[in-house]
């Protein structure tokens, strides 16, 4: 006699064979906060940007990617303390002389009003009220994200 | 009338409330290869180590973490060409003067026989036959991993 969960595994596997999607997150893991179609994890410890990226990766997640001003504001509303900074998945690409998201796309200049310099070894942090350029070696908190709802036929080509 | 998949969503959500696990991958996404309890994605493009880490992260996966010699050999068996190098999730920590996995753990010296220097800006690549220390700026392929089976009560504290 199969449990309902085991039966589900079969159902979802059969569904995947038709849709080539991964099951995805149906709701957020414990300790993660839902914000629309994402799950966010606000770290309690501090790290330089690179270690923050690594931490999110080992959690099978990404440093926060912000689509637009609206998402920025909604994320900032979850930050309780005005003075705390959190790394997101945006840093300065020296070769391309531009702000680059870790998914390879460039920052749309209208999306975020960045305070500070656009230069080598600069990474982006957000606070409750602002977006800052900081040295990537600065040890602050960070935000990881997971996509909550699976996208049909989502595949993973190289960046 | 709910579809079997929608019913499953409810069942799995109810199950999660009891076990605090995330649904996890039931099988590997398209283009990913199963190796035991992991899904692996071998890139077809090249990148420095840092960009490879970012790429895996945006795919909600991790640069490959290798538990032991046995897993290394099984992974190497999937590499077709003797000369091609792939980044894994291991680099040299200057502050700790040791090889460090991106999940924060240190390399067990018996696990991998590394050819090359343990020094600043060194990252680890694997080939079909060996494990090499290379400059992290070297542009080679990389391997991302996703855990295939969920672990009961798996939570995500900070590293």
């Amino acid at each position: 006699q199969k449990s309902s969960i085991e039966k589900c595994s079969v159902d979802i596997q059969q569904s995947r064979n038709k849709t080539t999607e991964r099951p995805g997150l149906l709701n957020c893991p414990i300790y993660w906060q839902q914000l629309r179609e994402k799950c966010l994890l606000f770290s309690h410890t501090v790290n330089p940007w690179n270690n923050s990226l690594a931490d999110c990766s080992t959690k099978e997640s990404s440093l926060l990617l912000i689509r637009d001003k609206d998402e920025l504001i909604h994320t900032q509303n979850l930050i309780r303390d005005k003075a705390i900074l959190f790394w997101i998945g945006l840093n300065f690409s020296l070769s391309e002389k531009n702000w680059k998201w870790i998914n390879g796309s460039f920052l749309n200049s209208n999306d975020l009003e960045i305070r500070g310099d656009a230069k080598e070894n600069s990474c982006i942090s957000i606070s409750q009220t602002s977006v800052y350029s900081e040295y990537c070696s600065t040890e602050i908190r960070w935000i990881c994200q997971k996509e909550l709802t699976p996208v049909r036929n989502k595949v993973y080509p190289d960046s | 009338q709910k579809s079997s998949i929608e019913k499953c969503s409810v069942d799995i959500q109810q199950s999660r409330n009891k076990t605090t696990e995330r649904p996890g991958l039931l099988n590997c996404p398209i283009y990913w290869q199963q190796l035991r309890e992991k899904c692996l994605l071998f890139s077809h493009t090249v990148n420095p180590w840092n960009n490879s880490l970012a790429d895996c992260s945006t795919k909600e996966s991790s640069l490959l973490l290798i538990r032991d010699k046995d897993e290394l050999i099984h992974t190497q068996n999937l590499i077709r060409d003797k000369a091609i190098l792939f980044w894994i999730g291991l680099n040299f920590s200057l502050s700790e003067k040791n090889w460090k996995w991106i999940n924060g753990s240190f390399l067990n010296s018996n696990d991998l026989e590394i050819r090359g220097d343990a020094k600043e800006n060194s990252c680890i690549s694997i080939s079909q036959t060996s494990v090499y220390s290379e400059y992290c700026s070297t542009e080679i392929r990389w391997i991302c991993q996703k855990e295939l089976t969920p672990v009961r009560n798996k939570v995500y504290p900070d590293s």
């Epitope: 020296l94 070769s95 | 493009t45 090249v46 420095p48 003797k82 000369a83 091609i84 190098l85 792939f86 050819r115 090359g116 690549s125 036959t129 060996s130 290379e134 400059y135 700026s137 070297t138 542009e139 080679i140 392929r141």
Partner: antibody, heavy 122, light 108 residues
Framework: QVQLVESGGGLVKPGGSLRLSCAAS????????MSWIRQAPGKGLEWVSY????????AYADSVKGRFTISRDNAKNSLYLQMNSLRAEDTAVYYC???????????????WGRGTLVTVSS | DIQLTQSPSSVSASVGDRVTITCRAS??????LAWYQQKPGKAPKLLIY???SLQSGVPSRFSGSGSGTDFTLTISSLQPEDFATYYC??????????FGGGTKVEIK
Amino acid sequence: QVQLVESGGGLVKPGGSLRLSCAASGFTFAQYYMSWIRQAPGKGLEWVSYISPSGSTIAYADSVKGRFTISRDNAKNSLYLQMNSLRAEDTAVYYCARSLMATGTHLYFDLWGRGTLVTVSS
Amino acid sequence: DIQLTQSPSSVSASVGDRVTITCRASQDISSWLAWYQQKPGKAPKLLIYAASSLQSGVPSRFSGSGSGTDFTLTISSLQPEDFATYYCQQVTSFPPYTFGGGTKVEIK
């Protein structure tokens, strides 16, 4: 057709400058380490310089360091070698060469151009 | 810098002969070695990489072996189109990427 075509060679006086170009076609240029290799008349092969796929890492042979500059334009599928302060001993056929993909800085040259002759003489 | 010494510097052979060329490195280069063939007025052609891997499109009569400091290129049965100069090259990840002095294979 997968190929590399060099241009820009010629006769130049000692102390002069020359810019070599290499046009790549038939492959994804931006994914490969590219090099310049030269061969003096009747002599063996000498590696001159390499550039990484993104252009972020560059290396030179000691014999040309400070005088030659390698660069690339991935949008134009082109590789360049700017040669300044040329000497008689720089006289050679200059080849543009592609390295096997994903072998990093272990440069196995799997595709070569036909070469362009640079003659440095007064 | 790593020096590569090829021997012999020239060899006279006939069609059908087995020809062996050696390359000795001044220090351990693991398997980071390539072999090239060059004909007069032409660019070199990659034959063998990673000491023993045959490059795509290269006839199977060519083979490479060795690791560390001693390497061999073997042509099992010499063909008319094989008369050329052969170079070894070390490709450890640190420049310069030195070539051997070359071995000329001539018709006996």
